[in-house]
Amino acid sequence: AQNITARIGEPLVLKCKGAPKKPPQRLEWKLNTGRTEAWKVLSPQGGGPWDSVARVLPNGSLFLPAVGIQDEGIFRCQAMNRNGKETKSNYRVRVYQIPGKPEIVDSASELTAGVPNKVGTCVSEGSYPAGTLSWHLDGKPLVPNEKGVSVKEQTRRHPETGLFTLQSELMVTPARGGDPRPTFSCSFSPGLPRHRALRTAPIQPRVWEPVPLEEVQLVVEPEGGAVAPGGTVTLTCEVPAQPSPQIHWMKDGVPLPLPPSPVLILPEIGPQDQGTYSCVATHSSHGPQESRAVSISIIEPGEEGPTAGSVGGSGLGTLALA
């Protein structure tokens, strides 16, 4: 069968090979399409109610005044010339409709590096067959499920026209230190070959790089956290962030029941004060941030002081907050 591609709404003429150019003609057209149950026969004498959809012209050709989705299928003509020689014509008709130019809607003006962001939704309306939508970054195709790229697609069909509406939502996770103004575009590729893709106007969101939180520093006095019994230890929690966050203290992973303060003084150290200390800075804009842990231990006279970070005993002596 000869493949014919016709645009929806346009006229189509299928030639009946071997048919005499003028009546009388001995020919018949057979149709097996979305409009028929099995085969429908049309003759030059007129198809009556079918004339609005397909009719045989005086030269034997079949004329479809406005091709529709239901006209997809097989068209066959059987003709006999004046000498009684029979000729058959066989056509496979497929129809298409090019949608309007796709558009990116709900597009983001700003993306945040390091986290997933919705870039926008690409919409194509009025295609047949459905076709596909694809996204491009700086002119190169974006592959879903690779490098923080995800795409959510939806296809709807108009109940009356049978044409398709496609939607594609793009999510990306921009790399830190990457392009500050990436260019995204979306293109529609028709379901039938030999038709070029349609591309949206590009969008260029800004990529915002969140400033990484500077670490919470815990300073111990004396250095190393080893003191003689009865000595004093001062722990200072240094947070560069502005405004100053609230500082709470932890011992052996348990919050100490003390009011917030950036300095913790342990006077007259006893065995019960030994343990692992850390501070927690709570910012209003983002969650709590914990410092490294330091070990406070008691050294008997004549002992070498342990290195910072060694684990001492537990217990809680007298605490002073500056």
Epitope: R35, T36, E37, A38, K40, G46, G47, G48, P49, W50, D51, S52, V53
Partner: antibody, heavy 119, light 107 residues
Framework: EVQLVESGGGLVQPGGSLRLSCAAS????????MSWVRQAPGKGLEWVAS????????YYVDSVKDRFTISRDNAKNSLYLQMNSLRAEDTAVYYC????????????WGQGTLVTVSS | DIQMTQSPSSLSASVGDRVTITCRAS??????VNWYQQKPGKAPKLLIY???SLADGVPSRFSGSGSGTDFTLTISSLQPEDFATYYC?????????FGGGTKVEIK
Amino acid sequence: EVQLVESGGGLVQPGGSLRLSCAASGFTFSNYWMSWVRQAPGKGLEWVASIKNDGDNTYYVDSVKDRFTISRDNAKNSLYLQMNSLRAEDTAVYYCARGGDITTGLDYWGQGTLVTVSS
Amino acid sequence: DIQMTQSPSSLSASVGDRVTITCRASQSVGSYVNWYQQKPGKAPKLLIYRASSLADGVPSRFSGSGSGTDFTLTISSLQPEDFATYYCLEFDEHPLTFGGGTKVEIK
């Protein structure tokens, strides 16, 4: 709202003529085939004639061929049936109906106009 | 010409009954069959188009089925306003042909 209103019916002698009209509203008249259907008193429905939306092609039941002519004026949203050489068996209520091709069949109908052929 | 044989020509039924009317075409007409309801002194009203699609504003108790040569109109639960005459129509070929009608009467 689709509306079809027939007029022009009446009493006519055998061999006489009558012209029926149908005024259409509520839809794009030029997009649709139009038809006439009749119903003899106490009988069933009988298709009489159809005309394509552009008026180029007309179709008739055998019993009225060469006597009846269907026509339309798309500018006036009107359908007509010119009936000549009327016979007693043409006595019926004549309905104007939208459609007549495979896209819809006959979907909307007028209220009908009575044609009586009698001496 | 295509003949449309409709049966029964009349039937008596009660409110709430399930009613089935059939039309048989003398040759295949695809799915190009409509069903109509007509009340005395009124124009026919489209109920079902293309064999099985319900026309706008028609109650869902009406349904149509079939293709090719055999077609059925079903009223799932007959209501008082459904007592009328019903016609099938084939519109696959000219002349368009109606069935002879089925008069649904109160039992």
